[in-house]
Structure formats: C-alpha cells, structure tokens
C-alpha cells in the first residue's frame, strides 16, 4: 500500500530582501512524488527551484525537498504543491514568526 508524506514548509533569510522557502516531504511510499513551488497557482519552472534527490530515509519510505528564493513580503503568493499516489495537497509559507508548517497528508 501507499504511505502518505509528511509535508513541512520552512523559511530562512537569504540575501537582503529575499527569503528561501523549503518544502520537505518525508516518510512516503512509493517513491514517485510531485513536489513543486507555485506562484499565484502556477508552478515555477525547473530553473527557479532547487531540487533534492528522492532518497530512502531508512524506514522503507522516502524523503525529498524543493526550495526557491522569493521576495520578502510576497510569501502569501507562494504555495508548495504535493501530489502522491493520486492525492494532492497545497501548503502555504509560514509567517515570519512561525517557521514550521507540518501536514501529514491523508
């Protein structure tokens, strides 16, 4: 059967006026997953995102991540889109004072 991913969105300060937002998916099976950043509902192209390999996490499940750099103050325009085993979900960027957003997808 399939194991849905845990999705975690974090933010970190980058260069002046920018932040890096990272979307991590972990503990999922099977390996095939779509994980991408969207701006105003449209996915960014491959060359505006940084991608991690889909790697085994030691529990028979997998993990991966995708990151992009955005302008501070535009966080609300960006969401992380996840699709796995026919299910999908969308995850917002946390506000500046809350650095983690966890969602165990069902």
């Amino acid at each position: 059967g399939s194991v849905p991913p845990m999705v975690n969105v974090t933010r970190s300060e980058a260069s002046e006026g920018n932040i890096t937002v990272t979307c991590r998916a972990s503990s999922f099976y099977p390996r095939n997953i779509t994980l991408t950043w969207r701006q105003d509902g449209v996915s960014l192209s491959h060359d505006t995102q940084q991608w991690g390999d889909v790697l085994p996490d030691g529990n028979g499940t997998y993990q991966t991540w995708v990151a992009t750099r955005i302008c501070q103050g535009e966080e609300q325009r960006f969401t992380c889109y996840m699709e796995h085993s026919g299910n999908h979900s969308t995850h917002p960027v946390p506000s500046g004072n809350s650095h983690h957003h966890h969602h165990h997808h069902h």
Partner: antibody, heavy 121, light 107 residues
Framework: EVQLVESGGGLVKPGGSLKLSCAAS????????MYWVRQTPEKRLEWVAT????????YYSDSVRGRFTISRDNAENTLYLQMSSLKSEDTAMYYC??????????????WGQGTSVTVSS | DIQMNQSPSSLSASLGDTITITCHAS??????LSWYQQKPGNIPKLLIY???HLHTGVPSRFSGRGSGTGFTLTISSLQPEDIATYYC?????????FGSGTKVEIK
Amino acid sequence: EVQLVESGGGLVKPGGSLKLSCAASGFTFSDYYMYWVRQTPEKRLEWVATISDGITYTYYSDSVRGRFTISRDNAENTLYLQMSSLKSEDTAMYYCSKGGGSTARGALDFWGQGTSVTVSS
Amino acid sequence: DIQMNQSPSSLSASLGDTITITCHASQNIHVWLSWYQQKPGNIPKLLIYGASHLHTGVPSRFSGRGSGTGFTLTISSLQPEDIATYYCLQGQSYPLTFGSGTKVEIK
C-alpha cells in the same frame, strides 16, 4: 554573440571514460544554468544533466546518474561532462546548451554544434 | 516522470499551408513548454518558450499556444526553409523530457 563550442568526443570502448568540454562566450557564463543534451542515432533528444548558475546544484537523468558528472569553471567560462563506465547506449551527439534565464524561463536558448561520442568495441 | 507525447511524427504540406504540431504532457506543466527547430544536418534552435513567447529573431509565422497539458506549435504560410524536425521540451521539473519530434516535409 552567444557561442558554445564542444570538444572531447570520440570513439571509446564500453566501460571506458571520456571528458567533454564546452567553451562559452558572448554572455555572462556564471549567471546561467547550463545543460548537456544528447541526440541518439535515431534522432531522439535526451536531457542528460544540468548545473545551476552558482555550481551548487546538479541534476542528472536516471540513465547517467552515478556514471556522468557535470561541472563548470566560471573563471574559464567552461562547462564539462565527465563520462565513465560508458555503454553502447551512450552513443550520441552531445550538445552543450545555455539556460534561458529570466528572459526564456524553462527553455534552452542557445546550443553548441555538438561533439560526437561513439561507444563500441 | 513527465512524458511528452508529440504528434504527428511526420507531416507533408504544401508551401503556404498552415500546419499544427501537438504536444501532450502526462501531467500539468502549466506554461513551461518550449519548441525547437532542427534543420537537416544542423543543431536544434529555440523557437518558442513559455508555451507562447517567440524567441528573438524567430519569424512571426511561428506561434505557440496552450497551458496545462495540451500545447500546439503552428506554422502559418509554410516556407521552404521550414523543412525541419520540431521538438517540444517540458521545463516544469526534472527529468526534463522532450517530445519524440515531428518531421515536416514539403509536398
């Protein structure tokens, strides 16, 4: 004028190694993603590898991961593809391509003339 | 992986005709689709990026449309110099994938 000039191709035996180079000029090399794409004898185009502008990130097709390494020297304006454990199915024309950057997002806007790689015993 | 299904594999048309080539993506790639022209014995050249934007120096008889999963390249008033093979490429996510190509010939 953007120019990409590949070199280093040739005939190699299965299991052998080869290093391709791509000399770039006419643009600020360090600002752009760079790519290797190959064209098989059947004329099919296949993406091989990508390296990001800051050298930080590299990406590979499943068919070459673990055997090929993409790298760049921003001081010398040169892109490389180190190929090892070569197989007959790696026989192709190898093209160096420049990423479109912010003006042609997601596309490969300039290509070199290619260098031919033949893997045969 | 995203598969790109390109059709037809070849077509023959008369000079002055309008022809359309199609690429279908196996999943939503939004607008991250580019088209390339490869003339016999030559290298691929970018025609269209972002599904509909003409690359610098490309004649206006070339046009691209589509978003999501369905995309078209149209050549209006086919010219002798348009004899080539045309490829689409999805630039949404890795691995980047090309269509299998459409060979355009003159009747």
